[in-house]
Amino acid sequence: IWELKKDVYVVELDWYPDAPGEMVVLTCDTPEEDGITWTLDQSSEVLGSGKTLTIQVKEFGDAGQYTCHKGGEVLSHSLLLLHKKEDGIWSTDILKDQKEPKNKTFLRCEAKNYSGRFTCWWLTTISTDLTFSVKSSRGSSDPQGVTCGAATLSAERVRGDNKEYEYSVECQEDSACPAAEESLPIEVMVDAVHKLKYENYTSSFFIRDIIKPDPPKNLQLKPLKNSRQVEVSWEYPDTWSTPHSYFSLTFCVQVQGKSKREKKDRVFTDKTSATVICRKNASISVRAQDRYYSSSWSEWASVPCS
Amino acid sequence: RNLPVATPDPGMFPCLHHSQNLLRAVSNMLQKARQTLEFYPCTSEEIDHEDITKDKTSTVEACLPLELTKNESCLNSRETSFITNGSCLASRKTSFMMALCLSSIYEDLKMYQVEFKTMNAKLLMDPKRQIFLDQNMLAVIDELMQALNFNSETVPQKSSLEEPDFYKTKIKLCILLHAFRIRAVTIDRVMSYLNAS
């Protein structure tokens, strides 16, 4: 048993039929010695008396909020949560496996630049009685500070018969130098509590590997005289690290017909303009990627040819 | 990656072209190592990230863009003790910090060159003949060092009398390539920045 936060405890259980469970001793937080009784949740039935209560925790029915009282007055609470281990593996019932970029990916994180700010998100089909808390650090043995906000519900989607809920959190490394070469990864730890079930999820990454620039901005077309060609121009996104001559981007320009089956013309360039042939009903899209370290491409910025 | 190969303008900062070739060569070598050594811990997640230049050079700090010198987090260990000479410097624009920066890059390349050559000598003794260092990568390191043209004592190649442990050597190769790729990215950013200024 260990303390998750004040008055909230996690009991780690091997989960198999007829498992013996864990013997837990709860101590009433009071200087009083006599006349103490214990109850569970909203029930008034006395489970035991004395300053300590010993319980055998085997399943969720044994978890909950234990309260010690004296003479009708509440002295203290202890909320017991369960963390299940099945076949040596901690349960992952609360979050959905996003399967990207690999199986057992429950947390996904992205950064728009090298400032040390990043966003992580996760998915669940659970809609109520759900709380998350997020901690992060750079490295684990001698951790350096990363500050995370509160996790918030950021999107709801319908997937077949199920509703899917996306939660996200923003974190910022306390003292980040955009030009630094990372040797220790960022560690992100999410505690998830659904009703009386506790689970934890972790992710470890370098900012450089989760970079995904915002799409290029101010995408414009300038027709060239007596030609089907147009000059496409764009700018670096505002959120990208500066100076741009140090944190350079490379770009992919794509001409796409109305039909998805039509052949796409693609040009790669380090410049912020390109000359392409604009077909009728086609659209021109541009996306960006770090020029020197191949992490993710940005989403496309698009304009119609007409 | 399907990108056009940049061909430098004649008046271009002379080291930019070499640094781009360096990044391409080390990235290719790292990819080859990951594929060839697929049953070894050779991915970014699996290896320990070691920097052989730590406490010996300070390329990131010495080469910091002017715009980032206001960032306290970037200034924790500025070094100011490098040789100041080198042909990449367009003389009028030469600044003390720029000289420190380029000499720090030179020292990095020299250190990696020695490590890679020593390692290659060991890998050539491996009866499995599983992987060797790409001669192109070694040549590109050499070219960039020549372009930087700093006078510096030659470091003798390390020789080892004991029988090489090929498994450990291959793990070390992965660690070295990952670290060198990160440094090559920094070098490319620096050259791009100097070229623009």
Epitope: L40, Q42, E45, L47, G48, K58, G61, D62, G64 | -
Partner: nanobody, 122 residues
Framework: EVQLVESGGELVQAGGSLRLSCAAS????????MAWYRQAPGKQRERVAT???????DYADSAKDRFTISRDNAKNTVSLQMNNLKPEDTAVYYC????????????????WGQGTQVTVSS
Amino acid sequence: EVQLVESGGELVQAGGSLRLSCAASGSIVSISAMAWYRQAPGKQRERVATITRGGTPDYADSAKDRFTISRDNAKNTVSLQMNNLKPEDTAVYYCKAALRTPTHDYNYYDYWGQGTQVTVSS
């Protein structure tokens, strides 16, 4: 709908024995403590015995050495074996259980049975 149904109450002679049973049915997620209470005419309801989910019993002074509480978690039942009954044990005996239901599946609430009459004649 959750129901607690007591059975086994009847008229018995002093010194005799009775076994009361209580079965919880309906939508039940889990049961914590189960207990027997009694209320004699003109008196307040008082606790007789409690048994925790883990099977630990606790008795009121009046029930010690004479009464035994037991439960079957698989069947959601609780029993009270009463021996050496006295006229002062005459009362309506109520079963009480702390239940979690699908609507309150992580909070125990108290539920009561309707009671069963035990009369001990001298």
